[in-house]
């Protein structure tokens, strides 16, 4: 079976997000990926979308992320734009209305996105072969 176009869009967005750091990418996010042993793939994607939404909702107007220059502000706006796109596409892939997110360890956003990219690339290699 062919790969979902949403999956390709997610990988593309993750590539954009992981190529460059911003002031916000060192901040922490709930690491649901480390605690996804006994969950279905759909639940993992749903939880990833949930924690990403929590992250950008919390940090969208965070002065630590907005920075002191127009350049840093622009990059932060771009980061939020890509996170919102990723969130939207993960919900589409998950196909679930909601999912519980338990307390878990924290990870930096950049590490979380790198691991999510690895998971998505593995999924893509399986569905394209």
């Amino acid at each position: 079976h062919k790969c979902d176009i949403t999956l390709q869009e997610i990988i593309k967005t993750l590539n954009s997000l992981t190529e460059q750091k911003t002031l916000c990418t060192k901040l922490t996010i709930t690491d649901i990926l480390a605690a996804s042993k006994n969950t279905t793939e759909k639940e993992t994607f749903c939880r990833a979308a949930t924690v990403l939404r929590q992250f950008y909702s919390h940090h969208e107007k965070d002065t630590r992320c907005l920075g002191a220059t127009a350049q840093q502000f622009h990059r932060h706006k771009q980061l939020i734009r890509f996170l919102k796109r990723l969130d939207r596409n993960l919900w589409g892939l998950a196909g679930l209305n909601s999912c519980p997110v338990k307390e878990a360890n924290q990870s930096t956003l950049e590490n979380f996105l790198e691991r999510l990219k690895t998971i998505m690339r593995e999924k893509y290699s399986k569905c394209s072969s």
């Epitope: 954009s16 997000l17 220059t69 502000f73 622009h74 706006k77 771009q78």
Partner: antibody, heavy 123, light 106 residues
């Protein structure tokens, strides 16, 4: 294909204000997430960034020129402009306008440049 | 302000030679580094972005590497049309260019 073209007087008197305009063709200057910048190059020397203006309308300027520089955008004319006040002979240079930013990246600095315009400061 | 130190300031090499230019940042700039080529009387042309990515349409003999503070730009086999001045540029915190490296043919 996006093109940038600088225009303005080639000769400015000392202590006056240098005014240049960059006209963008082949695309909209309002297109998010692109931003616009000015860079200059004195004869026989290297490149110096002057300043940039972003989609939000916010600007960044080179700290060494900040007190004398203003960059603004006129979306109706698809142009952005540079004003540099109290010029001296040290401001004699080729002035370039350029585009930064990208749709598929967080940032991407100055990939498209105008051809440049020579400005001489002399009485 | 972030300072960019580029070396050498000029070099002379033969056609087919491997040419290497280095750029050092005064602080960590991650991978926010571009390399430009400027021919006499022309505007700079972006060759490499984010330290190692080749801009579309740029020949594969051009390459870049590095991260943090130390960066390298390489022309694997110098061609006559590569005669130009090359600049590095950081855009991690505002924008600063290196002093340039003038490349000539022996």
């Amino acid at each position: 294909q996006l093109q940038l073209q600088e225009s303005g007087p080639g000769l400015v008197k000392p202590s006056e204000t240098l005014s240049l305009t960059c006209t963008v063709s082949g695309g909209s200057i309002s297109s998010i997430p692109y931003y616009w910048g000015w860079i200059r190059q004195p004869p026989g020397k290297g490149l110096e960034w002057i300043g940039s203006i972003y989609p939000s309308g916010s600007t960044d300027y080179n700290p060494s020129l900040k007190s004398r520089v203003t960059i603004s955008v006129d979306t109706s004319k698809n142009q952005f402009s540079l004003k540099l006040s109290s010029v001296t002979a040290a401001d004699t240079a080729v002035y370039y306008c350029a585009r930064g930013g990208a749709r598929d990246r967080i940032d991407h600095a100055f990939d498209i440049w105008g051809q440049g315009t020579m400005v001489t400061v002399s009485s | 302000d972030i300072q960019m130190t580029q070396s050498p300031s000029s070099l002379s090499a033969s056609v087919g030679d491997r040419v290497t230019i280095t750029c050092q940042a005064s602080q960590d700039i991650s991978n926010y580094l571009n390399w430009y080529q400027q021919k006499p009387g022309k505007a700079p042309k972006l060759l490499i972005y984010d330290a190692s990515n080749l801009e579309t349409g740029v020949p594969s003999r051009f390459s870049g590497s590095g991260s943090g503070t130390d960066f390298t730009f390489t022309i694997s086999s110098l061609q006559p049309e590569d005669i130009a001045t090359y600049y590095c540029q950081q855009y991690y915190d505002l924008y600063t260019f290196g002093g340039g490296t003038k490349v000539e043919i022996k």
